[in-house]
């Protein structure tokens, strides 16, 4: 640190601030009676160059002028942008042991003259805000550069404010701290920015604007909505705005939507009626403002108002299906099922369902309300029954949906033909069929119904179904379809008063089963062997089992086993075989086959038939 230059002085020519690429001469002079004692001629002045406090060069060889023992001039070139420190030291050459003594130092700054500021833009946020302008300063000057922002307007008035850029701060924006009021709306203003540093100055081109060009209204505030007569589709949006606003833009959307509804409102005065809202829907509303119909800028969007529209009575019809089970000779159990309305149909929280079962001729009516999507009743097997269901929310109920209760699989002539089920991908199955061949009444619709083939699924789980128009012969089922599970699929053809059905099994993805069936018993009856087994546990089936195989061979034989293939039926758990020799011990086992392949073998059982074999 050079605090006081007691021994001498250092000067710079042409100046301590120079343009990039220029050279400078640094002169170091000793004060009178300063220097090495006794031997003035042994005074040697050296110049050291520091960048960021690091010594980078000894300029001993750059002397251009030397008054021995008194002063030296050094030429410095190729100085980099920024500040460089030069320190002059005195080296008494007769005394090698003493280090050179600092004489004085100087800082040289290398930079460039400022470029004309460009791209000036000014804004005033709100009618009561203040004018702030920003600009592009151009290339970094590496010198302290002063910027003056000057605004001239009506009434012969000019205002100005200053800031500076250096290596610690950048000046490319100034808030003038003044407010332009609406009574100046027609006036023109001129703004310019001047940049000055030690190497020169430059001015921007004048930038002209009006009040309307730069004033950005504040976003509207205090947004609220009133629903007329608690309507779920009509509401009046209200807000507060700055006094001069003439145009508003409204945008609103349901919360889960990706596109906004946009509305422009002229002279709305903080009020606008919306008529196309969806009942019982969470909406987000935002508003923006503008001070002029054609010119000026839109404000930022207001903060969002989030609210839910009121309920309205449900619309649409419920999708109903049913199951019939005979209990005894004169009673049957009817289970009704229906799908929940989608939100746009429910238009509110469904509080309950109104269910009616009616015998058409005797006029018997059973009525009930339930919160569930199913309802079961025991009714007489006689008579023609019809069911209806409607959904109710706090505002009312939907129109009832009617369905005739018929014997769903009672008419063979209505059974669809050539039903097939093909796996399309991991989570859906394509079901196709042909229409009934000799239906004596027209098919009104098809119902494709499916449920997982797992123990207790009929009682535990409601069915899944799809309604298909009568001219369609296929359905892609995907609801609740999981891979590696076998589904029973029924295609029902329904006429006005009859039903016929065909059934098939299908899966969306399959693997070979994990294990084979477990043989539980082998019994001999009338010279035939009956093999009994337990089915493979449901999780281990891994799709629809197509058939079982029973293998057998003589014990200790190395020959290939014989086998018998049985079409899989869920109800079957034993099968006869009759080609085994008496008094020969056999080993038997079983496997299961899906479309993906055969399972490993199940348990082995030994058996020695006693009777006379065929």
């Amino acid at each position: 640190n050079i605090d006081v230059c007691k021994l001498g002085t250092v000067t710079v020519q042409p100046a301590p601030v120079i343009p990039l690429g220029s050279a400078a001469n640094i002169s170091c002079s000793l004060n009178p009676k300063q220097g090495c004692s006794h031997y003035p001629s042994s005074n040697e002045l050296i110049l050291l160059k520091f960048v960021n406090d690091v010594l980078v060069e000894n300029l001993h060889g750059k002397k251009v002028h030397d008054h021995t023992g008194h002063s030296s001039t050094f030429q410095v070139t190729n100085l980099s942008l920024g500040m460089t420190l030069f320190v002059c030291k005195l080296n008494c050459s007769n005394s090698q042991k003493k280090p050179p003594v600092p004489v004085c130092g100087v800082e040289i700054s290398v930079g460039v003259a400022p470029e004309p500021p460009q791209n000036i833009s000014c804004v005033q946020e709100g009618e009561n805000g203040t004018v702030a302008c920003s600009w592009n300063s151009g290339k970094v000057t590496y010198l302290k550069t002063n910027y003056t922002l000057q605004l001239s307007g009506p009434n012969n008035l000019t205002c100005q404010k200053q800031c500076f850029s250096d290596n610690r701060q950048n000046c490319n924006r100034l808030d003038l701290g003044i407010n332009l009021s609406p009574d100046l709306a027609e006036s023109r203003f001129i703004v310019r920015v001047t940049a000055i540093n030690d190497l020169g100055n430059s001015s921007s081109l004048p930038h002209t604007f009006t009040f309307l060009d730069i004033v950005i209204p504040l976003p509207p505030w205090d947004i609220r909505i009133n629903f007329l007569n608690a309507s779920g589709s009509r509401g009046t949006l209200q807000w507060e705005d700055e006094g001069q606003v003439v145009l508003n833009q409204l945008r609103y959307q349901p919360l889960n939507s990706t596109s906004w509804n946009m509305v422009n409102a002229t002279n709305a005065k903080g009020k606008y009626d919306l008529r196309d809202l969806r009942p019982f829907t969470e909406y987000e509303f935002q508003i923006s403002s503008k001070l002029h119909l054609s010119g000026g800028s839109w404000s930022n969007w207001s903060e969002s108002l989030r609210t839910r529209t009121p309920e309205e009575e449900p619309v649409g019809i419920l999708d109903i299906w049913y199951m019939k089970q005979d209990i005894d000779y004169d009673r049957q159990q009817i289970s009704l099922f229906w799908k929940s309305l989608n939100p746009s149909e429910a238009r509110g929280k469904i509080l309950h369902y109104q269910v009616t079962l009616q015998e058409v001729t005797k006029k018997t009516t059973l009525q009930n309300t339930t919160r569930h999507t199913s309802w079961t009743r025991v009714i007489p097997r006689t008579g023609a029954w019809t069911a209806s269901v409607s959904a109710a929310n706090s505002k009312g109920a939907s129109a009832p949906t009617h369905i005739n209760i018929v014997d769903l699989c009672g008419t063979g002539l209505l059974a669809p033909h050539q039903v097939s089920a093909k796996s399309e991908n991991m989570d859906n199955i394509l079901v196709t069929w042909q229409p009934p061949k000799k239906a004596d009444s027209a098919v009104r619709e098809y119902i494709v119904e499916w449920r997982a083939l797992q123990p207790g699924s009929i009682t535990k789980f409601p069915p899944h179904w799809l309604r298909i128009p009568p001219d369609n012969m296929s359905a892609l089922i995907s609801e609740n379809i999981k891979p590696y599970i076998c589904y029973e699929i029924r295609v029902h053809a329904l006429s006005e008063s009859q039903g016929g059905c065909s059934s098939i099994r299908g899966d969306s993805k399959h693997k070979a089963p994990v294990s084979g069936p477990h043989i539980t018993a082998i019994t001999e009856k009338k010279e035939r062997l009956f093999i009994s087994w337990t089915h493979i546990p449901f999780p281990e089936q891994r799709g629809c089992i197509l058939h079982y195989r029973i293998y057998w061979k003589e014990r200790d034989s190395t020959a290939q086993p014989e086998l018998c293939e049985i079409q899989y039926r869920r109800s079957q758990n034993s099968h006869p075989i009759s080609s085994l020799q008496p008094r020969v011990t056999y080993v038997l086992w079983m496997t299961a086959v899906t479309a993906a392949g055969e399972s490993p073998q199940g348990n082995e059982r030994e058996f020695c038939p006693q009777g006379k074999a065929n």
């Epitope: 205002c159 100005q160 407010n179």
Partner: nanobody, 129 residues
Framework: QVQLQESGGGLVQDGGSLRLSCAAS????????MAWFRQAPGTEREFVAG?????????FYDNSVMGRFTISRDSAKNTMWLQINNLKPEDTAVYYC?????????????????????WGQGTQVTVSS
């Protein structure tokens, strides 16, 4: 009681310079608007230059003096100055210091006399040709 005291006026040659001072006492005006007005014989008092008082002090000038007059203040000393260069005979007038008890942010109000609450007695500036 608030007092504004101008000084630094006098007789000066055409093209010469002056530095007018305004010392405020009885109240601190460091954050408030202050201005210089002038009044030539037989004319209305007119705005010359002012400081808004809002953060960082924006300076205002009548276009007729822009570039020749520079307004500044030292908040710590409660003093305001008007540096006048390249004086012209039409600058001859009594120069008044004015102070407000608020920040002035409205562009339209800066040059209005009613904006300012306190006034000095004035200092005479005469420019001879």
């Amino acid at each position: 009681q608030v007092q504004l005291q101008e000084s630094g006026g006098g007789l000066v040659q055409d093209g010469g310079s002056l530095r007018l001072s305004c010392a405020a006492s009885g109240r601190t005006f460091s954050n408030y608007a202050m201005a210089w007005f002038r009044q030539a014989p037989g004319t209305e008092r007119e705005f010359v230059a002012g400081l808004s008082g809002s953060g960082g002090d924006t300076a205002f000038y009548d276009n007729s003096v822009m570039g020749r007059f520079t307004i500044s203040r030292d908040s710590a000393k409660n003093t305001m100055w008007l540096q006048i260069n390249n004086l012209k005979p039409e600058d001859t007038a009594v120069y008044y210091c004015a102070a407000a008890t608020h920040v002035v942010v409205s562009y339209g109000l800066v040059r209005k006399r009613g904006t300012y609450d306190y006034w000095g007695q004035g200092t005479q500036v005469t420019v001879s040709s």
